[in-house]
Interface confidence: low
């Protein structure tokens, strides 16, 4: 199709080489035509529409995105050629930064219903360049946290080194919807609620003698609880003794709840005490079994191929730790009465004897 009639917008993505960040293009279709696709006017930043199309409306029009090669080749379908670019309704999400994203991106309705729709398209000329590290040491992150129940702010990364007085007018979007309440380089939140989380986009205009560009940055905001003031608690095992059958395999599970920490370095390990000795056991990796905003439950198992007489004299200890402190839970094995036959007992004693020899050769100071 002929793209000469498309409205044009120039955007600049100055990405930080220090952090991962995403970028978003909106399909801002204009409204000179009487088309049900193009019912969004080019809003000035002071205007707020009653309804922004392509966000939550049920009759989402299908939009097709293309990339225009610089060498004049035919338009390329984004979905086929660029796996790191995701088409999500009327937005285009770039998952990884890089100058190779520089180019012209065109969006238009998939279904052309009338002759007017042919020119119903937007061409976005995107320039991508790395931000010089020297420009600002304390620039805002592209991932920002807000503490639930407290006051917070969301800063526009590309403007966070400028004072509010110096800052140009900024247009903010949240999850693709225009936010009209602020024109500043940061959004101040009086009290943080869950719904403040989302994908925020901040735009401002940068002009030189030749042309003007929209400088855009994307911020992923999550709402979090404060760091826990508690050490982890062990949910399982609850009992300090466990009935077992000699000669049979055994798995003991340790489950512990760790409160939320922004910097989360949980420790969970099993060790064995035998008289005056104790040593850490090599066990399968710990795994997270439930993750909530408030806490995380982590599980780690110790596996015994066969329970021996020696195991009955040992103490199995689950040790868990976070930045606040540690907790332990000890388990003593107790033989189930009347469980195994004579063969089981002889087998267990044979294993016990072999293990004693091996054990004593490694631990000379064992009593």
């Amino acid at each position: 199709f002929n793209i000469s009639g498309c409205s044009t917008k120039k955007l600049l993505w100055a990405y930080s080489t220090r952090s991962e960040e995403e970028f978003i293009l909106f399909c801002d279709l204009p409204e000179p035509q009487k088309s049900h696709f193009c019912h969004r006017s080019q809003l000035s930043p002071t205007q707020v529409p009653d309804h922004l199309p392509f966000t939550d409306s049920k009759d989402l029009p299908d939009v097709q995105w293309y990339r225009q090669p610089s060498n004049g080749d035919p338009l390329e379908d984004i979905r086929k050629s660029y796996p790191h670019i995701i088409q999500d309704k009327c937005t285009l999400r770039f998952l990884t930064p890089g100058v190779n994203n520089t180019g012209s991106y065109i969006c238009r309705p998939k279904m052309i219903k009338s002759p007017y729709d042919v020119a119903c398209c937007v061409k976005m000329i995107l320039e991508v360049k790395p931000q010089s590290n020297a420009s600002c040491e304390n620039s805002a992150s592209h991932k920002q946290d807000l503490l639930l129940g407290s006051t917070g702010s969301i800063s526009c990364p590309s403007l966070s080194c400028q004072s509010d007085a110096q800052s140009p007018e900024v247009t903010w979007y949240k999850n693709g919807k225009l936010l009209s309440m602020t024109r500043s380089n940061r959004i101040v939140v009086d009290e943080v609620y869950i719904y403040h989380q989302g994908t925020y986009v901040c735009d401002y205009t940068q002009s030189d003698t030749a042309s003007s560009w929209t400088v855009r940055a994307v911020v992923q905001v999550r709402t979090i609880v404060g760091d826990t003031k508690l050490k982890p608690d062990i949910l399982d095992p609850v009992e300090s003794t466990l009935e077992v059958e000699l000669g049979k395999p055994l798995t003991i599970s340790c489950k512990a709840r760790f409160g939320f920490e922004r910097v989360f370095n949980p420790v969970m390990k099993w060790y064995i005490k035998d008289a005056d000795l104790e040593w850490e056991v090599s066990v399968p990796e710990a795994k997270s079994i439930k993750s909530t905003l408030k806490d995380e439950i982590i599980e780690r198992n110790i596996i015994l191929e066969k329970v021996t007489q020696r195991d009955l004299r040992r103490t199995f200890v689950c040790f868990v730790q976070n930045s606040i402190g540690n907790t332990t839970q000890s388990v003593q094995l107790k033989e189930k009465r009347g469980s195994g036959g004579l063969n089981d007992i002889f087998e267990a004693q044979k294993i016990e004897w072999h293990e004693t020899v091996r054990f004593q050769s490694h631990h000379h100071h064992h009593h």
Partner: antibody, heavy 123, light 107 residues
Framework: QVQLQESGPGLVKPSETLSLTCTVS????????WTWIRQPPGKGLEWIGY???????NYNPSLKSRVTISVDTSKNQFSLKLSSVTAADTAVYYC?????????????????WGQGTTVTVSS | AIQLTQSPSSLSASVGDRVTITCRAS??????LAWYQQKPGKAPKLLIY???NWESGVPSRFSGSGSGTDFTLTISSLQPEDFATYYC?????????FGQGTKVEIK
């Protein structure tokens, strides 16, 4: 194991204020949202509102002008006050804990409920 | 407020039957939907959250599916203890709202 227990008068006169308390045992009131829900006899469930451990609230617009939810973290309790009651406020009132589960986005679950307390509005 | 409409309002089934309850939202709610079971004189009990995730301890015969506006709760093989009223609830936007309930009775 966290348990919730509602308490308060079972009979309230029309135009008076209904007051209920929910006591949280077996766990802390911190780090959760605490909710009130009601169920008129033979009818469905209606969300009244919530309070966070820090005291921030959100109420159902249909009841907002009459509802106050408060929290007392030192006693591990939160309370509901509903003013200017009428016979239409006769219901079983439940308190519940709201947890937020994270899976990329946040999803809310009311995972622990009190057993409910019946409140009748009658003169 | 978002309205949730459950269907059917009631149904009669036998032990071992496969039962399906639907919940339709008046607008898209992504997957922010929970299902509860309520027995007479008892508080509701959470079965499914985020449209399809089991709450811990809930039998695997209960399953949830759907996204956007249409959701389903399925009981693959009805057990005697499953006779109860089932409610859906949306957590997409305030105020939280519930469906009117579906009563599952013994045939």
């Amino acid at each position: 194991q966290v348990q919730l227990q509602e308490s308060g008068p079972g009979l309230v006169k029309p135009s008076e204020t209904l007051s209920l308390t929910c006591t949280v045992s077996g766990g802390s009131i911190s780090n959760y949202y605490w909710t009130w829900i009601r169920q008129p006899p033979g009818k469905g469930l209606e969300w009244i509102g919530y309070i966070s451990d820090s005291g921030s609230t959100n109420y159902n617009p249909s009841l907002k002008s009459r509802v106050t939810i408060s929290v007392d973290t030192s006693k591990n309790q939160f309370s509901l006050k509903l003013s200017s009651v009428t016979a239409a406020d006769t219901a079983v009132y439940y308190c519940a804990r709201e947890t937020i589960v994270v899976r990329g986005f946040y999803f809310y679950v009311m995972d622990v409920w009190g057993q409910g307390t019946t409140v009748t509005v009658s003169s | 407020a978002i309205q949730l409409t459950q269907s059917p309002s009631s149904l009669s089934a036998s032990v071992g039957d496969r039962v399906t309850i639907t919940c339709r939202a008046s607008q898209g709610i992504s997957s922010a939907l929970a299902w509860y079971q309520q027995k007479p004189g008892k508080a509701p009990k959470l079965l499914i959250y985020e449209a399809s995730n089991w709450e811990s301890g809930v039998p695997s015969r209960f399953s949830g599916s759907g996204s956007g506006t249409d959701f389903t709760l399925t009981i693959s093989s009805l057990q005697p203890e499953d006779f109860a009223t089932y409610y859906c609830q949306q957590f997409n936007s305030y105020p939280w709202t519930f469906g009117q309930g579906t009563k599952v009775e013994i045939k």
